[in-house]
């Protein structure tokens, strides 16, 4: 059973992930972002189901494409280089979902834009955080 300290750690990691995703979304939605039109042409895949930490596998598998999209944006829109930002997110996601269990992600049929994709995972983080508090 999860201890209060492990729950707190999970909550903090989710909050960190949430802030990173929100920062990316804000950077992309910046009205000065000249690459937004092109960014919106990139297709992202959404999970059929995202209710547990193991479903973060679906986010992890989209982090490569996410890094490529962020490479299009002006670096000043973000505090970190895309490579470093995605590296940080990968560390958090790996700690949250664990590396031992090999969960195969199931994707929804419909693809999403980067904005829809980020909003989906922001909602996921908020939902899990709310169950922990």
């Amino acid at each position: 059973a999860p201890t209060s300290s492990s729950t707190k750690k999970t909550q903090l990691q989710l909050e960190h992930l949430l802030l990173d995703l929100q920062m990316i979304l804000n950077g992309i939605n910046n009205y000065k972002n000249p690459k937004l039109t092109r960014m919106l042409t990139f297709k992202f895949y959404m999970p059929k189901k995202a209710t547990e930490l193991k479903h973060l596998q679906c986010l992890e598998e989209e982090l490569g494409p996410l890094e490529e999209v962020l490479n299009l944006a002006q670096s000043k829109n973000f505090h970190l280089r895309p490579r470093d930002l995605i590296s940080n997110i990968r560390v958090i996601v790996l700690e949250l979902k664990g590396s031992e269990t090999t969960f195969m992600c199931e994707y929804a049929d419909e693809t999403a834009t980067i904005v829809e994709f980020l909003n989906r995972w922001i909602t996921f983080c908020q939902s899990i955080i709310s169950t922990l508090t």
């Epitope: 092109r38 042409t41 990139f42 297709k43 895949y45 596998q57 992890e60 598998e61 490569g64 494409p65 490529e68 999209v69 490479n71 299009l72 790996l94 590396s99 195969m104 992600c105 994707y107």
Partner: antibody, heavy 123, light 107 residues
């Protein structure tokens, strides 16, 4: 169906420069990141680098930096890979291949390949 | 750089037999691994992507699996046209790296 057609075989002397082309047909080149991979005779595959033809941004493998230049001409849907200061170890078949994030998940991998261009470096 | 180690270097089997090819990553790469088949004088052909997904036009006898940093390509029942060299590739981070290859030959 996307096809990649590469230029013909080249024979070069050590120290020379070679420039190989890769023409995309069946779609526009700007939909793809164009990658280059090489294979020495009887050896495995080695990633050289890639270009985003939309904005000409490039990424190169560390061991090719300074010697390789990847470019693209969107008006002709053609990518180029130029390798300078050639040495005998550069004798290999050079392939262009693609990645795209605009279509299916499968096409995020090296799904389309050129037929390969043999570059022979010999004195 | 991420190193991919393929084993065995050569696998000698007969048509109809089951082939199991291994690829081990030097660090965690999630499912960012694909498998390619290459025949002499030809370009590589994508077989499996994202560790377990079958590429379009590839027969169902090919399958991929993953356990941690260990990846496996299985050919359930070998056909004569399956004898070739197989490579794994990681897309987790640049530089993208390939395994050294496994040659599948007729016994």
């Amino acid at each position: 169906q996307v096809q990649l057609v590469q230029s013909g075989a080249e024979v070069k002397k050590p120290g020379a420069t070679v420039k190989i082309s890769c023409k995309v047909s069946g779609d526009t080149i700007t939909a793809y990141y164009m990658h280059w991979v090489r294979q020495a005779p009887g050896q495995g595959l080695e990633w050289i680098g890639r270009i985003d033809p939309e904005d000409d941004s490039t990424k190169y493998a560390e061991n090719f930096k300074g010697r390789v230049t990847i470019t693209a001409d969107t008006s002709t849907d053609t990518a180029y890979m130029e390798l300078s200061s050639l040495r005998s170890e550069d004798t290999a078949v050079y392939y262009c291949t693609t990645i795209t994030f605009l279509y299916t998940r499968e096409l995020r991998w090296f799904a389309y390949w050129g037929q390969g261009t043999l570059v022979t470096v010999s004195s | 750089d991420i190193v991919l180690t393929q084993s065995p270097a050569t696998l000698s089997l007969s048509p109809g037999e089951r082939a199991t090819l291994s690829c081990q990553a030097s660090q965690y790469i999630s499912n960012y691994l694909s498998w390619y088949q290459q025949k002499p004088g030809q370009a590589p052909r994508l077989l499996i992507y994202s560790a377990t997904s079958l590429a379009s036009g590839i027969p169902a006898r090919f399958s991929g699996s993953r356990s941690g940093t260990d990846f496996t390509l299985t050919i359930s029942s070998l056909e004569p046209e399956d004898f070739a060299v197989y490579y794994c590739l990681q897309h987790y981070s640049t530089p993208y790296t390939f395994g050294q290859g496994t040659k599948l030959e007729i016994k």
